[in-house]
C-alpha cells in the first residue's frame, strides 16, 4: 500500500515545535511529511480548527525521478506579531486517500510584559471635585497587578495594593499627572501619563444686585479654584427670544451674546448699554491660569421700564372762541417701555397752570373758561410709561382759528376745577 494510507502509519516525520514569547514576536512553526505519489496539500489547525487564512508556505521535494516515488513535503506557518488570539495548540493535517492524518501538536504561548487594554486619559476637572480614572492591563502571565502613581509618586506600597482598574480621586487642588504601572512576573509596563487639569469650580448664586433701564448689576459667588487664583470672570448676556427664549440650563442662545469681563474680586459687574424693558439671559464663568470654569446656567433677567426719552412730536394747538383744539404724534425717541398715555398742561399769562391726563388719545378739545380772552395761552405735552413722565414738549402757543381751517369734531374736555398737579417747566 502507498505510504500514509494505513491508519497506524503517520506520514509526519517532523512535528510543529513550541513557541513562547512576548507580544509582537514573529515565529515559524514547521512540519514535515514523507509521502508516496502526488504530494497532498498541508492544512494547519489551531485548537482543532482549520486555519483558513493561514500565512503558510509549502515546499515539495521529490526523492526520485518518478511521480510515484516518495516526496518530502515541508509546510511552514508564519506567525507575525504574536497576539493573544494566536495562542493555542497547532497541528498539521493532510488528507491521503480516504484517510486523514494529523501531526503531533506544537504549542504557541504568549508570555511577556503586561499589555494595556485601557490607559488613563487626559481630562479637566473642577477643583476639589471627585473623579475616576481607569487602567486595565493583561498578561500572560497573569496575574497583572496595577500600581497607580500621582505626580510620579506611587499611591500604594506595592503593585496589587491600593486601587486597581479604577482609581477614585476625591478631588485635586492642583493640576496633576497620573499614570499606572502594570506588573506581572515578567516585569513592569508603564502607561501613558494623563494630565488632569484643575479648573475653577462653576460660580454659584448668580443674581441681580440692582437694575436700571439700560443696565443691570449682577453678582455671583466664585467656586474653589485650587492653588490657582482666579484671574477674571466672564459674563455673557443675550436677548431672550420673544418669550420663546432659552430655558435656564439650555446650552447656547440663538444669537451672539454680549460678553463682558470682570476683574476679580469683587465678584460683581455692571452690564451697560442694554435695552430697557427687555428680557435677557445671563451667565458667568470664571478663569484661572489653568483655564475657565464651566458656565453657570442661563439666568433670566429683565431690565425695567424707563421713561420716554423724548417729547411727543408735531404738536399743534388752535383756538376758536372758547374752545382750543390740540393734537400731537407719538415721540420719535425710544419710549423705553409701554406707552400708558399723555399728559397735557396749558397756562395763560396770568392764570394758573392746568394739568390733564389725556390717556392714549393724541388729540383733545379744551373748553376754555371765560370769554376766551385769556392772552398768551400755551400748551405742553409729555408721554408717560409706568416708569414716569418723559420730557415735556416746548410750550406751543395757541393760534387763532381762521375760517377755512378744518374743525374736527372732538369730545370736549372741561378744565378741571383744580389742577391735578403742577410743575414749573417754563
Amino acid at each position: 500500500a502507498p505510504r500514509g494510507t494505513q491508519a497506524e502509519e503517520s506520514p509526519f516525520v517532523g512535528n510543529p515545535g513550541n513557541i513562547t514569547g512576548a507580544r509582537g514576536l514573529t515565529g515559524t512553526l514547521r512540519c514535515q511529511l514523507q509521502v508516496q505519489g502526488e504530494p497532498p496539500e498541508v492544512h494547519w489547525l489551531r485548537d482543532g480548527q482549520i486555519l483558513e487564512l493561514a500565512d503558510s508556505t509549502q515546499t515539495q521535494v521529490p526523492l526520485g525521478e518518478d511521480e510515484q516515488d516518495d516526496w518530502i513535503v515541508v509546510s511552514q506557518l508564519r506567525i507575525t506579531s504574536l497576539q493573544l488570539s494566536d495562542t493555542g495548540q497547532y497541528q498539521c493535517l493532510v488528507f491521503l486517500g480516504h484517510q486523514t492524518f494529523v501531526s503531533q501538536p506544537g504549542y504557541v504561548g504568549l508570555e511577556g510584559l503586561p499589555y494595556f487594554l485601557e490607559e488613563p486619559e487626559d481630562r479637566t476637572v473642577a477643583a476639589n471635585t471627585p473623579f475616576n480614572l481607569s487602567c486595565q492591563a493583561q498578561g500572560p502571565p497573569e496575574p497583572v497587578d496595577l500600581l497607580w502613581l500621582q505626580d510620579a509618586v506611587p499611591l500604594a506600597t506595592a503593585p496589587g495594593h491600593g486601587p486597581q482598574r479604577s482609581l477614585h480621586v476625591p478631588g485635586l487642588n492642583k493640576t496633576s499627572s497620573f499614570s499606572c504601572e502594570a506588573h506581572n512576573a515578567k516585569g513592569v509596563t508603564t502607561s501613558r501619563t494623563a494630565t488632569i487639569t484643575v479648573l475653577p469650580q462653576q460660580p454659584r448664586n448668580l443674581h441681580l444686585v440692582s437694575r436700571q433701564p439700560t443696565e443691570l448689576e449682577v453678582a455671583w459667588t466664585p467656586g474653589l479654584s485650587g492653588i490657582y487664583p482666579l484671574t477674571h470672570c466672564t459674563l455673557q448676556a443675550v436677548l431672550s427670544d420673544d418669550g420663546m427664549g432659552i430655558q435656564a440650563g439650555e446650552p447656547d442662545p440663538p444669537e451672539e451674546p454680549l460678553t463682558s469681563q470682570a476683574s476679580v474680586p469683587p465678584h460683581q459687574l455692571r452690564l451697560g448699554s442694554l435695552h430697557p424693558h427687555t428680557p435677557y439671559h445671563i451667565r458667568v464663568a470664571c478663569t484661572s491660569s489653568q483655564g475657565p470654569s464651566s458656565w453657570t446656567h442661563w439666568l433670566p433677567v429683565e431690565t425695567p421700564e424707563g421713561v420716554p426719552l423724548g417729547p411727543p412730536e408735531n404738536i399743534s394747538a388752535t383756538r376758536n372762541g372758547s374752545q382750543a383744539f390740540v393734537h400731537w404724534q407719538e415721540p420719535r425717541a425710544p419710549l423705553q417701555g409701554t406707552l400708558l398715555g399723555y399728559r397735557l398742561a396749558y397756562q395763560g399769562q396770568d392764570t394758573p397752570e392746568v394739568l390733564m391726563d389725556i390717556g392714549l388719545r393724541q388729540e383733545v378739545t379744551l373748553e376754555l373758561q371765560g370769554d376766551g380772552s385769556v392772552s398768551n395761552l400755551t400748551v405742553c405735552v409729555a408721554a408717560y410709561t409706568a416708569a414716569g413722565d418723559g420730557p415735556w414738549s416746548l410750550p406751543v402757543p395757541l393760534e387763532a382759528w381762521r375760517p377755512g381751517q378744518a374743525q374736527p369734531v372732538h369730545q370736549l374736555v372741561k378744565e378741571p376745577s383744580t389742577p391735578a398737579f403742577s410743575w414749573p417747566w417754563w
Epitope: 497587578d145 506611587p154 506595592a158 503593585p159 496589587g160 495594593h161 506588573h183 506581572n184
Partner: antibody
Framework: QIQLVQSGPELKKPGETVKISCKAS????????MNWVKQAPGKGLKWMGW????????TYADDFKGRFAFSLETSASTAYLQINNLTTEDMVTYFC???????????????WGQGTSVTVSS | DIQMTQTTSSLSASLGDRVTISCRAS??????LNWYQQKPDGTVKLLIY???RLHSGVPSRFSGSGSGTDYSLTISNLELEDVATYFC?????????FGSGTKLEIK
C-alpha cells in the same frame, strides 16, 4: 488583613542551627518578596537580604553571606531563615517583613512579623 | 553602601507638641525614603513611604518631607501612643539601610 506571624523565641547552644519561620496571610504570598531584618538588643535595624517568593531566589547582604539561608514553603505561604553554626553574635531579634513585588525589591517593607528572639548560650 | 544618619538619638516632648525627626542620606536616594515606627513592645510598622505618602491606617498627624539627601518626619500633635523609636530607611539601592533611630519620649 495582612499578617506575618513568626515562630517563637529560640534558645540554642553555640555551633547549633536555628530555623525561624514566618507565615504570611491576607495576600498572595508569591507576588511579594520577603525581607529579613536583624536587630541587636537596644540597637538599630539591619537588613539581611530578601527572597523572591516567586522564583525562590535569595539575595543576601554582604554581612550575611555564608551561614545564613533563606528558604520557602510556598504551599504553606511560609518563609524561613536558617542560621548555621550559631555564635553569641547571633543573639538578636530577627524580623521578617513583606516587601518587593516579584523581582523588584525597591518597594517599602509594609508589613512586619512580630520578631523572633534567638538566645545563644552554652 | 548608603549611610543613613539620624543625628538625634532621643528627644522628649509634651503631649500636643509638634515634633520633627530628621534623617540624612550619604547620597541622593531619589525620594525612596521610608519611615518606620517601633513601639516599646518591639512591633514595627511602616508609617510613611516615598517621602510623604501615608501607609494605610496611619493617622494624618504624621507627615513626611524632604528631597535629595535630607528628609524629615513630623508629628503635628503628639499623642501618648506615639511614644516609640522612629527609623528612616532608604529603598533606592541594595543593600537597604536604616538610620540608627530616634527614640521619642513624653516629658
Amino acid at each position: 488583613q495582612i499578617q506575618l506571624v513568626q515562630s517563637g523565641p529560640e534558645l540554642k547552644k553555640p555551633g547549633e542551627t536555628v530555623k525561624i519561620s514566618c507565615k504570611a496571610s491576607g495576600y498572595t504570598f508569591t507576588k511579594y518578596g520577603m525581607n529579613w531584618v536583624k536587630q541587636a538588643p537596644g540597637k538599630g535595624l539591619k537588613w539581611m537580604g530578601w527572597i523572591n517568593t516567586y522564583t525562590g531566589e535569595p539575595t543576601y547582604a554582604d554581612d550575611f553571606k555564608g551561614r545564613f539561608a533563606f528558604s520557602l514553603e510556598t504551599s504553606a505561604s511560609t518563609a524561613y531563615l536558617q542560621i548555621n553554626n550559631l555564635t553569641t553574635e547571633d543573639m538578636v531579634t530577627y524580623f521578617c517583613a513583606k516587601g518587593g513585588y516579584y523581582s523588584n525589591p525597591i518597594y517599602p517593607m509594609d508589613y512586619w512579623g512580630q520578631g523572633t528572639s534567638v538566645t545563644v548560650s552554652s | 553602601d548608603i549611610q543613613m544618619t539620624q543625628t538625634t538619638s532621643s528627644l522628649s516632648a509634651s503631649l500636643g507638641d509638634r515634633v520633627t525627626i530628621s534623617c540624612r542620606a550619604s547620597q541622593d536616594i531619589n525620594n525612596y525614603l521610608n519611615w518606620y515606627q517601633q513601639k516599646p513592645d518591639g512591633t514595627v510598622k511602616l508609617l510613611i513611604y516615598y517621602i510623604s505618602r501615608l501607609h494605610s491606617g496611619v493617622p494624618s498627624r504624621f507627615s513626611g518631607s524632604g528631597s535629595g539627601t535630607d528628609y524629615s518626619l513630623t508629628i503635628s500633635n503628639l499623642e501618648l501612643e506615639d511614644v516609640a523609636t522612629y527609623f528612616c530607611q532608604q529603598g533606592n539601592t541594595l543593600p537597604f539601610t536604616f538610620g540608627s533611630g530616634t527614640k521619642l519620649e513624653i516629658k
